[in-house]
Interface confidence: medium
C-alpha cells in the first residue's frame, strides 16, 4: 500500500525518499515517475539521477535535499489537481532485480482560501508555501502561510529540520529508507 502525502493547489508538495550510499559520493541512479513503479525503470519519468548528478528533470520537479547523501526526496512546485496520483521513487541498485521501489500517493486538495490579489512584481510567485509531512496516522499538513519571500530552498531547509526531528524515524520504520552496502 502507498504512503499518502497531501498538498494544496498552488503550494509545493514534498515526497520523501532516501537511501544510504555505501560510501560518500558512491551514488546509485534514481528515477522518479508518475504512476506506480513498474517492473523495470520508472514510467512517465519526471526526474532522473545518475552516479553523479541530476541528469533529467521536467518542469516543476527537482531534488532540494542533499542527494549526494542519499536524500532523493522530490519537490513538486506549484501543484495543481492534475498532480494527484501515485509517484514512484526507484533506487536503481546494481544487479538483477535489486531495485528498491517506493510508491507514494499524492493527494492534492483545492486551496482553502483564495488569497487576496497580490501586486505583480516578478515571477517568484507569492503562493502560500507548505510542507507536507507524515507523522503517526494520517498525513499532517503544515502551512507556512503567505510568505512571498520564502522560496523552495528555504522550504527545503525547513523540511530537512522537520524530517530530522519528526519524520525520519517514521519513514525509516516504514521502510522508506534503505541502506546500500
Amino acid at each position: 500500500s502507498e504512503v499518502e502525502y497531501r498538498a494544496e493547489v498552488g503550494q509545493n508538495a514534498y515526497l520523501p525518499c532516501f537511501y544510504t550510499p555505501a560510501a560518500p559520493g558512491n551514488l546509485v541512479p534514481v528515477c522518479w515517475g508518475k504512476g506506480a513503479c513498474p517492473v523495470f525503470e520508472c514510467g512517465n519519468v519526471v526526474l532522473r539521477t545518475d552516479e553523479r548528478d541530476v541528469n533529467y528533470w521536467t518542469s516543476r520537479y527537482w531534488l532540494n535535499g542533499d542527494f549526494r547523501k542519499g536524500d532523493v526526496s522530490l519537490t513538486i512546485e506549484n501543484v495543481t489537481l492534475a498532480d494527484s496520483g501515485i509517484y514512484c521513487c526507484r533506487i536503481q541498485i546494481p544487479g538483477i532485480m535489486n531495485d528498491e521501489k517506493f510508491n507514494l500517493k499524492l493527494v492534492i486538495k483545492p486551496a482553502k482560501v483564495t488569497p487576496a490579489p497580490t501586486r505583480q512584481r516578478d515571477f517568484t510567485a507569492a503562493f502560500p508555501r507548505m510542507l507536507t509531512t507524515r507523522g503517526h496516522g494520517p498525513a499532517e499538513t503544515q502551512t507556512l502561510g503567505s510568505l512571498p519571500d520564502i522560496n523552495l530552498t528555504q522550504i527545503s531547509t525547513l523540511a530537512n529540520e522537520l524530517r530530522d526531528s519528526r519524520l525520519a524515524n517514521d519513514l525509516r520504520d516504514s521502510g522508506a529508507t534503505i541502506r546500500i552496502g
Epitope: L63, T153, Q154
Partner: antibody
C-alpha cells in the same frame, strides 16, 4: 538590488581550462538556482547547466557532460563554471543567470557576461 | 531535446508599428515559454514568462500569447528602444532550449 557580477575576460589556448566566477548579492544566495548560458559571437543562446547553491546538486547539458563542472561557495555567495579541454568553438560570452525555481529555468537576473576567447 | 524555431529571423519596422514574432516548439510545452530581449553587448532581459505573463517593469506594449506548440510575442507601438534581438525559450523539460532569435531592425 540583485546583482550578479562575473569575472573578467579570459584568453585561453586550445586544450586548456577556464574557470569563470559569478558573485551574487542583493538576495539570499541559497534561495535561487543558478544557470550558465553561453553565446558564441553572432549566435544564439545555449544553456549549459544548473546548480542548486543550497545542496550543490547540478545538471549539465549533454553536450557539455564530462567537460563542465559547476560549483559554489556559499561563504562568498559565488558560483563557478569550469570548462575543460577548450577548443576554438568554445569562444563565447558566458553568462550566469538566476532562476527562482524549476518552475522552471526562467532567468530573471543575468550577469554581465564573461568573454572567453580560445585561440592558439 | 525540444527544438524551438522562430520566425522571422529578421524584420524591419518603424517606430509606432505593431509587430508580431512567432515561436514554435517541436512538441507540446503547455505554457512553459518565456521571451527575452537582448541588445548588442548586453545580457538578455526577461520580458514574458508562462507564455503571457509580463515580467515586472516591462512596458505593457509587450504581450505574449499561445500554448502547446505555437506562441507569439507582440509589440504594440514600437519604441526606439525596442529594436533588439528577441529569443523564446522553453522550460518544459531539460535541457531548457532557446529559439534562434529574431532581430528587429529600424526600417
Amino acid at each position: 538590488q540583485v546583482q550578479l557580477v562575473q569575472s573578467g575576460a579570459e584568453v585561453k589556448k586550445p586544450g586548456a581550462s577556464v574557470k569563470v566566477s559569478c558573485k551574487a548579492s542583493g538576495y539570499t544566495f541559497t534561495s535561487y538556482y543558478m544557470h550558465w548560458v553561453r553565446q558564441a559571437p553572432g549566435q544564439g543562446l545555449e544553456w549549459m547547466g544548473i546548480i542548486n547553491p543550497s545542496g550543490g546538486s547540478t545538471s549539465y547539458a549533454q553536450k557539455f557532460q564530462g567537460r563542465v563542472t559547476m560549483t559554489r561557495d556559499t561563504s562568498t555567495s559565488t558560483v563557478y563554471m569550469e570548462l575543460s579541454s577548450l577548443r576554438s568553438e568554445d569562444t563565447a560570452v558566458y553568462y550566469c543567470a538566476r532562476s527562482p525555481g524549476v518552475v522552471t529555468a526562467l532567468f530573471d537576473y543575468w550577469g554581465q557576461g564573461t568573454l572567453v576567447t580560445v585561440s592558439s | 531535446d525540444i527544438q524551438m524555431t522562430q520566425s522571422p529571423s529578421f524584420m524591419s519596422a518603424s517606430v509606432g508599428d505593431r509587430v508580431t514574432i512567432t515561436c514554435r516548439a517541436s512538441q507540446d510545452i503547455g505554457s512553459y515559454l518565456a521571451w527575452y530581449q537582448q541588445k548588442p553587448g548586453k545580457a538578455p532581459k526577461l520580458l514574458i514568462y508562462a507564455a503571457s505573463t509580463l515580467q515586472s517593469g516591462v512596458p505593457s506594449r509587450f504581450s505574449g500569447s499561445g500554448s502547446g506548440t505555437d506562441f507569439t510575442l507582440t509589440i504594440n507601438s514600437l519604441q526606439p528602444e525596442d529594436f533588439a534581438t528577441y529569443y523564446c525559450q522553453q522550460s518544459y523539460s531539460s535541457p531548457p532550449t532557446f529559439g534562434p532569435g529574431t532581430t528587429l531592425e529600424i526600417k
